[in-house]
Amino acid sequence: EVEKTACPSGKKAREIDESLIFYKKWELEACVDAALLATQMDRVNAIPFTYEQLDVLKHKLDELYPQGYPESVIQHLGYLFLKMSPEDIRKWNVTSLETLKALLEVNKGHEMSPQVATLIDRFVKGRGQLDKDTLDTLTAFYPGYLCSLSPEELSSVPPSSIWAVRPQDLDTCDPRQLDVLYPKARLAFQNMNGSEYFVKIQSFLGGAPTEDLKALSQQNVSMDLATFMKLRTDAVLPLTVAEVQKLLGPHVEGLKAEERHRPVRDWILRQRQDDLDTLGLGLQGGIPNGYLVLDLSMQEALS
């Protein structure tokens, strides 16, 4: 807190410029008009103030805008954005994507801070949904952003925004998140042809149901093992040996290396050993020949 003192004669700032770095903190407080500062915030970003001097400037803005800064000031906060508390940011109404980008640039290269998380939350809530341009921007700065959202939050992502998603953006998503994103991706890419469709949908397949995997097996997609291992176990279990063989194509040989891991392990336990043997991979653990498999869930449904 800087003591209130009168501005010395001839020191009243007429504009925000480099000469202000020679002002002591009390002089900045006394001689810089807050309204002038607000209208020339863009200039602050070109002047090498110390952190202490910036604290004084922030204090002046806080006094001028106790209810929260207007967007014209927010857009030019630069480093001062990192001095804001989440409580400060909750008072803001940020509607411009340019403002969002400018503030994310300041934090670039660092983890998502509480300030950034609050800013994004305010921005997205203000827009009502995660539109494509916003998602594009956020995933460019924070590739893991999408997977930091809850399934409920992801439900507000329109299918058109899915075009902005890159495979690496989904690296840390869990199955519940992919369950929400997969139907949106399916809708977004529905007009693409077979091979192009598979390239786009591949990253989302951790949310695909059995019937969609069966359909893909008829399209010679040659799914790699890494993708197969991320599929939902409950979606893989009903697939036949022939369907898995078609789904994986030449990659089917990789099943041997993964036979002790889910979902391959659980899938093997559901297949007839005879059928597994047709793959010639030496997969063991299938249902022995001569055993009858009763699907009790089907029986209950009939009764």
Epitope: A46, P48, Y51, L54, G78, Y79, F81, A102, V106, K108
Partner: nanobody, 115 residues
């Protein structure tokens, strides 16, 4: 973002020193740089500044005509040449920088003693 100052030391009145400011982990080329100093028991004060292009320089009245700030783009540093040093120039000297989008950096300081 971190800046690193060097070149400080002990010098007699009337002597000269050349301080350097370099960046750690990034390049200073598009940063405007300010030099500041803090004497024991006193508030930090501005000494000089130079724009990112090097085309604009400013000095505090107390050092005008004695100190010169410049950019050495080959070495990616900003230098403060201090001539005709006086005992009252004794302080810890810091550089602070501002780059694109208002990104900021500051150093830990280098000590100058004129005695």
């Amino acid at each position: 973002l971190q800046l690193v100052e060097s070149g400080g030391g002990l010098v007699q009145p009337g002597g000269s020193l050349r301080l350097s400011c370099a960046a750690s982990g990034f390049t200073l080329d598009n940063y405007a740089i300010g030099w500041f100093r803090q004497a024991p028991g006193k508030e930090r004060e501005g000494v000089s500044s130079i724009s990112s292009s090097g085309g604009s320089t400013n000095y505090a009245d107390s050092v005008k005509g004695r100190f010169t700030v410049s950019r050495d783009n080959a070495k990616h540093t900003v230098c403060l040449q201090m001539n005709s040093l006086k005992p009252e120039d004794t302080a810890v000297y810091y550089c602070a920088g501002v780059g694109d989008y208002g990104r900021r950096a500051m150093g830990q300081g280098t000590s100058v003693t004129v005695s």
